[in-house]
């Protein structure tokens, strides 16, 4: 759910990590209605998701730590 | 009703590893992250680590990556933690704990009843 | 040494209002809901408040929480001899140390 690169929803599905090459977060204060994480998966799709959920912390942290260990 | 029903008491000694199990019962596993927590006594809550069993991948805290491994058998719906190289201040309650993984509250809403880990030569 | 900070102890007599304090940083508390656990001893951890302020069903009203930048607090009002008891808050953290964290406790005595 997304317009002019900004989301305007979030996703209802968990997202499985291993489907995801990495994110982009959205900042209500710059420009966009809502805070989100933006997921960008092999499919070369975004799927917008709740930054607040556990599954989408969770999956950020895995995210973060991979690139930290690079 | 989700309950979570732990493995018993252990005593080990210094420099090795126990294992303890956490089943559960009552509900399906695919939306729930389960975390171990343990207390020392005397000591506060500290988070070990976490698994989301549906990703199949697990997440330590710092002061036990290297020497924890938490696993998931979905088909029995039981979580595992091994902790290797045991220390004396590894005595400890170890608690595992459910959280509903497509909320945003991050709370640990069911526990199990604890398991005991003695170090002790 | 807990990443979140609360006081060791806190005591009132039946009836009264007890308040603990739970402080953080703007990685746990201040972008994430923090949550309160009772501790009996011998027994599990009960989650008491989630979401900052929200109680699950079989959680009197007497506990109440609140949040306000990078600081917590949970309230007892109506204090009485079975909230004798230790009480932990909680929160995720963004910083990649480990991301739950544990306040160290504060033992809650009814006098």
């Known amino acids: 759910a997304s317009n002019f690169d900004c989301c305007l929803g979030y996703t209802d599905r968990i997202l499985h990590p291993k489907f995801i090459v990495g994110f982009t977060r959205q900042l209500a204060n710059e420009g966009c209605d809502i805070n989100a994480i933006i997921f960008h998966t092999k499919k070369k799709l975004s799927v917008c998701a709740n930054p607040k959920q556990t599954w989408v912390k969770y999956i950020v942290r895995l995210l973060s730590k991979k690139v930290k260990n690079m | 009703q989700v309950q979570l029903v732990q493995s018993g008491a252990e005593v080990r000694k210094p420099g090795s590893s126990v294992k303890v199990s956490c089943k559960a019962s009552g509900d399906t596993f695919n939306n729930f992250a389960i975390s171990w927590v343990r207390q020392a006594p005397g000591h506060g809550l500290e988070w070990v680590g976490g698994?989301?069993?549906?990703?199949?991948?697990?997440d330590y805290a710092q002061n036990f990556t290297g020497r924890v491994t938490i696993s998931a058998d979905k088909a029995t719906k039981t979580v595992y933690m091994e902790l290797r190289s045991l220390r004396y201040d590894d005595t400890a309650v170890y608690f595992c704990?459910?959280?509903?993984?497509?909320?945003?509250?991050?709370?640990?809403?069911?526990w199990g009843q604890g398991t005991m880990v003695t170090v002790s030569s | 040494q807990s990443v979140l900070t609360q006081p060791p102890s806190a005591s009132g007599t039946p009836g009264q209002r007890v308040t603990i304090s739970c402080s953080g940083t703007?990685?746990?508390?201040?972008?994430?809901?923090v949550s309160w656990y009772q501790k009996l001893p011998g027994t599990a951890p009960k989650l008491l408040i989630h979401?900052?302020?929200l109680r699950p069903s079989g959680v009197p009203d007497r506990f109440s929480g609140s949040k306000s930048g990078t600081s917590a607090s949970l309230a007892i009002s109506g204090l009485r001899s079975e909230d004798e008891a230790d009480y932990y808050c909680a929160a995720w953290d963004d910083s990649l140390s480990g991301p739950v964290v544990f306040g160290g406790g504060t033992k809650v005595t009814v006098l």
């Open positions: 703007t990685s746990n508390i201040g972008s994430n809901s």
């Open positions: 704990a459910r959280t509903k993984i497509e909320l945003d509250n991050d709370a640990f809403d069911i």
């Open positions: 698994i989301i069993p549906v990703f199949n991948t697990a």
């Open positions: 979401s900052n302020n």
